[in-house]
Amino acid sequence: GSTVPPMVNVTRSEASEGNITVTCRASGFYPWNITLSWRQDGVSLSHDTQQWGDVLPDGNGTYQTWVATRICQGEEQRFTCYMEHSGNHSTHPVPSGNSHHHHHHHH
């Protein structure tokens, strides 16, 4: 089948006092191979501080997955979610407050 780029959205939720959990979700993509990970200070965030969801079919012939990490409140700017799919990539910041960011991939 043809390539379908993911929709990526980043959300935040309160985890504990002074900490937040940031979750990066990719959905509606095909084929299933995707890289989704968090970067801190422009470099890779260690794997043991990230939690990944399985890549699962979403019922529309496409796939979805997620990656999450816990960070200190006030340091959101230092983190970005990186997505690579079928040769295209994008980076997605943590939204401020309780807003959500929805992005299609870009070159």
């Epitope: 970067r39 200070d41 422009g42 470099v43 980076t91």
Partner: antibody, heavy 119, light 107 residues
């Protein structure tokens, strides 16, 4: 556009301190990004030295950690490099640069300033 | 620390030729790689980031590829303005390190 300009003495004596300034125009260093120092030795080897980020957090190359300090003056939109106890091995062209948090690559560099360590 | 090994150290080529420069990392850097071009007496200029993505304004005769520990930069139909030195840099982890460079000279 972000522009960076290095300045400082071109000649430093061994055992003394090297001090350089990077003046940033077109962007506030407290808004975002990591503000870096990189040097290039006479035989062209490049070495990342460290950064100070938008919030004042620093990160240094472990090979220099005991000798390096990066500070800033937010009122002048400048950041600084200090390297103590220099030797002739610290002779290099020193560049300031920055990177965004989407990845630690360097989109723009200053023009560089040559520092010679010699008695 | 991750060490970056570039080859060749230098090469001579004619205008119109195709040249390839390679960079090997001492560990898996998962496409966290950038390439720079430097002309004599000038600052390095970003060519490629995320291993394959051309920076703004970089001509399409440049292309990059690789994965894991092995990466390459290819210049198709070399132009007079392409002569100079080329450096790779990883950003998988700190400290950030550069390759020793490849000098591309006119034949």
């Amino acid at each position: 556009d972000v522009q960076l300009q290095e300045s400082g003495p071109g000649l430093v004596k061994p055992s003394q301190s090297l001090s350089l300034t990077c003046t940033v125009t077109g962007y506030s260093i407290t808004s975002d990004y990591a503000w870096n120092w990189i040097r290039q030795f006479p035989r062209n080897k490049l070495e990342w030295m460290g950064y100070i980020n938008y919030s004042g957090t620093t990160n240094y190359n472990p090979s220099l950690k005991s000798r390096i300090s990066i500070t800033r003056d937010t009122s002048k939109n400048q950041f600084f490099l200090q390297l103590i106890s220099v030797t002739t091995e610290d002779t290099a062209t020193y560049y300031c640069s920055y990177y965004r948090y989407d990845g630690a690559w360097f989109p723009y560099w200053g023009q560089g300033t040559l520092v010679t360590v010699s008695a | 620390d991750i060490q970056m090994t570039q080859s060749p150290a230098s090469l001579s080529a004619s205008v119109g030729e195709t040249v390839t420069i390679t960079c090997r990392a001492s560990g898996n850097i998962h496409n966290y790689l950038a390439w720079y071009q430097q002309k004599q007496g000038k600052s390095p200029q970003l060519l490629v980031y995320n291993a394959i993505m051309l920076a703004d304004g970089v001509p399409s005769r440049f292309s990059a590829s690789g994965s894991g520990t092995q990466y390459s930069l290819k210049i198709n139909s070399l132009q007079p303005e392409d002569f100079g030195s080329y450096y790779c840099q990883h950003f998988w982890s700190f400290p950030l390190t550069f390759g020793a460079g490849t000098k591309v000279e006119i034949k």
